[in-house]
Interface confidence: low
């Protein structure tokens, strides 16, 4: 009931708490002398459901049968209306609509650790919408019974606060949960278990790893476990991997040897425990141990390439280049590279350790047979040396690959194709494709890139260190024993018309013709491989079309003669450059008047 109900009463039958779908009778009745002043037949009793009028009646009492009430609480209020006055609240009542508890399902109990306490969980089923009390009962051997109640409306977990011990691991325990409310009760099916069934060990702790003699092949993982643990499972992975390696071990007693770890790799290790082969559940995974495995001496061999440059009649410069070993081959931090240069006939050798970079340049006599060996060293040792005999890589003309072409293949890729050399193609042991940014003046500091290709291949896709709008000098070498032949071509992955034309820096007269000299276009303005230069000229102050001379581009060429100018006529000259994408704007203009005699 609500309010003081001084003027009358509201009664509800059969009960204030009803089952969903039931009908209730609500009666509102006035107490004596509480009706309207003067004439009681003018009493108008009105029944409200929340704030909505559902029934009314003139007189001292009102009866109303109500159906279809929803789950939850519904408020009914009775009011009195008299002529010429506001409605007066008489009394009210709340009706609670709910359901009987469903049978609790999936009752399961667990004890976390040998020293933990038994706690059970279950599924309540549908919401009763009423106050429902849950009672959890645990019975064991020797008529032991524990009982605990939960009065939380959403109760689905209870901890008994008791600890099962392993003294009689086969003893049976039975748990049951009962739900009760004013509309009924229901009990779960009993759940029967032993100590071994429900104890979930604590995750292992104090995990550490030891490498005997700092070797990855002698690695032992140690940990601590609760006393009754029989099984462990270990999982481990390189820190940068998503896939775990899994190992199951029995009676490990807190240690296990791992045989397949990779050197110089950070691993993550976790361990889980279980008390019995087929009973009970696995513990949570332990906290991760992260540890780096020791280095081992490098495996594999360096990929080494070289370049020769003539200095003078007696000396040549050798530039050696090599690629870093992969992480799996380096097996540690590479501390230095060891380069040994040896003159094969005289046996003279020099060795140098190189740190911090992957190239080395030296000057040697042009005479003699020279060989180099390069190896990589970490704290545990060195890789097998890569040995190369220094030869003239382009000396054997008959070994030169034919019809070399270079074509753009998508963003920042160039597809290089060739035909085998005329000389017996089966003599080719491998091809090497080499590329470097084209720099006028042949700057030897420009980084060199290369890849090796099997003798049956006639194409290679180069993508490493390829930039758009840069011209690359590409060479294809065919190697056979101590001989090599090569062919070269220029190529780019993307091109545009050059951003500027060549700058004419001098015009000189020689025997009735002129020699034009120009500065190369800066590399960053060439926008790809140059194909041609054009020299334009016309008479000064003339409106006629200029004449032009087109010169194929050659890296080293920076001058060209023109012999078709008339003497004592002033000409204006300028130059442009062309890539496959088009022609540049004009370079600077120069005037020139040929002084020679007329014919």
């Amino acid at each position: 009931k609500i309010d003081a109900c001084k003027r009358g009463d509201v009664t509800v039958k059969p009960s204030h708490v009803i089952l969903l779908g039931s009908t209730v009778n609500i009666t509102c009745s006035l107490k004596p002398r509480q009706g309207c002043f003067h004439y009681s037949r003018r009493n108008k009793l009105i029944l409200y459901k929340f704030d909505r009028r559902i029934n009314f009646h003139h007189g001292h009492s009102l009866n109303s049968q109500v159906t279809g009430l929803p789950l939850g609480t519904t408020l009914f209020v009775c009011k009195l209306a008299c002529i010429n006055s506001d409605e007066i609240q008489i009394c009210g009542a709340e009706i609670f609509v709910g359901v009987a508890p469903e049978q609790p399902q999936n009752l399961s109990c667990i004890q976390k650790g040998e020293q933990g306490t038994v706690a059970c969980t279950w599924e309540r089923g549908r919401d009763t919408h009423l106050y429902t009390e849950y009672t959890l009962q645990l019975s064991g051997p020797k008529n032991l019974t524990w009982q605990k109640q939960c009065k939380d409306i959403y109760c689905d977990y209870l901890d008994f606060g008791i600890n099962l011990t392993p003294e009689s691991p086969e003893s049976n325990f039975t748990a049951k949960v009962t739900a009760v409310n004013s509309l009924g009760s229901s009990s779960s099916l009993p759940s029967t278990f032993t100590f071994l069934d429900i104890v979930r060990p604590l995750p292992p702790w104090d995990i550490r790893i030891k490498f005997q003699k700092a070797s990855v092949s002698r690695c032992t993982l140690y940990w601590r476990d609760e006393g009754l643990v029989l099984l462990n499972r270990l999982r481990y992975r390189p820190s940068n991997s998503r896939l775990w390696n899994m190992v199951n071990v029995t009676k490990a007693k807190g240690r296990h040897d791992l045989l397949d770890l990779k050197p110089f790799t950070e691993y993550e290790f976790q361990i889980s425990s279980k008390l019995h082969l087929y009973k009970g559940s696995w513990s949570d995974w332990s906290e991760s141990l992260r540890a780096q495995t020791p280095e081992e001496e490098p495996t594999g061999m360096l990929d080494v390439w070289y370049m020769k440059r003539h200095i003078d009649y007696s000396r040549q410069q050798i530039s050696l280049f090599w690629k870093n070993l992969s992480v799996s081959e380096a097996r540690g931090k590479i501390l230095h590279y060891q380069v040994t240069l040896q003159e094969l006939t005289g046996g003279k050798a020099m060795t140098q350790n190189i740190t911090g970079h992957t190239s080395w340049t030296t000057v040697i006599p042009r005479t003699g047979n020279w060989a180099v060996a390069v190896s990589a060293a970490n704290s545990k040792g060195s890789s097998l040396p890569t040995r190369i005999n220094i030869m003239n890589l382009c000396e054997a003309g008959l070994l030169a690959p034919r019809q070399v072409s270079a074509n753009s293949e998508g963003m920042d890729n160039i597809l290089v194709t060739w035909q085998p050399p005329r000389k017996d193609p089966s003599a080719v042991q491998e091809y090497v494709v080499e590329w470097r940014e084209l720099h006028p003046g042949g700057d030897t500091q420009v980084p060199l890139n290369w890849l090796r290709s099997r003798p049956y291949n006639v194409s290679a896709l180069i993508s490493e260190n390829i930039k758009s709008y840069i011209c690359y000098e590409i060479r294809v070498y065919a190697l056979s024993g101590d001989q090599g032949g090569c062919s070269s071509i220029l190529g780019n992955s993307k091109h545009k018309a050059p951003l500027s034309g060549p700058h004419i820096n001098a015009i000189t007269e020689e025997k009735g013709s002129i020699l034009i000299s120009w500065n190369s276009i800066p590399v960053q303005e060439q926008m790809g491989c140059l194909l041609h230069y054009r020299i334009y000229w016309k008479e000064r102050d003339s409106n006629s079309q200029p004449q032009l001379c087109e010169i194929p581009y050659r890296v080293s060429q920076n001058s060209h003669p023109i012999n078709s100018l008339q003497p004592r006529v002033t000409y204006v000259l300028w130059m442009t450059a062309l890539t496959a994408a088009g022609e540049s704007s004009h370079g600077n203009e120069r005037e020139f008047c040929l002084q020679g005699k007329a014919n």
């Epitope: 911090g356 970079h357 992957t358 190239s359 500091q445 420009v446 980084p447």
Partner: nanobody, 115 residues
């Protein structure tokens, strides 16, 4: 894009000292190994020194060991090269680079050692 600006060069007598600075921008300096190169008049580019991204590992060419110290300040995106006991053969343009080939380098700063 990558920008490297060297400074601190100058003329100095043999036995003198200089500190070269390289201000870096346009890339993640703190995760990049850094390098110093030099180019003497009429000679090719020569590697001088390198330092790991965290600064823990340093490397030097034999001719400068004991006289040159490379260091870095990742908070300031700055690389340093301290030159001590300078000799006439140290005369060169000094460049800092973010790659070990010297391809990505700055404009350079001139160091001249003469009496």
């Amino acid at each position: 894009q990558v920008q490297l600006q060297e400074s601190g060069g100058g003329s100095v007598q043999p036995g003198g000292s200089l500190r070269l600075t390289c201000a870096a921008s346009g890339f993640t300096f703190s995760t990049s190994g850094m390098h110093w190169f030099r180019q003497a008049p009429g000679k090719g580019l020569e590697w001088v020194s390198s330092i790991s991204s965290g600064g823990g590992d340093t490397y030097y060419t034999d001719s400068v060991k004991g006289r040159i110290t490379i260091s870095r300040d990742n908070a300031k995106n700055t690389l340093y090269l301290q030159l001590n006991d300078l000799k006439s053969e140290d005369t060169a343009v000094y460049y800092c680079s973010k790659d070990p080939s010297g391809a990505t380098r700055g404009q350079g700063t001139q160091v001249t050692v003469s009496s």
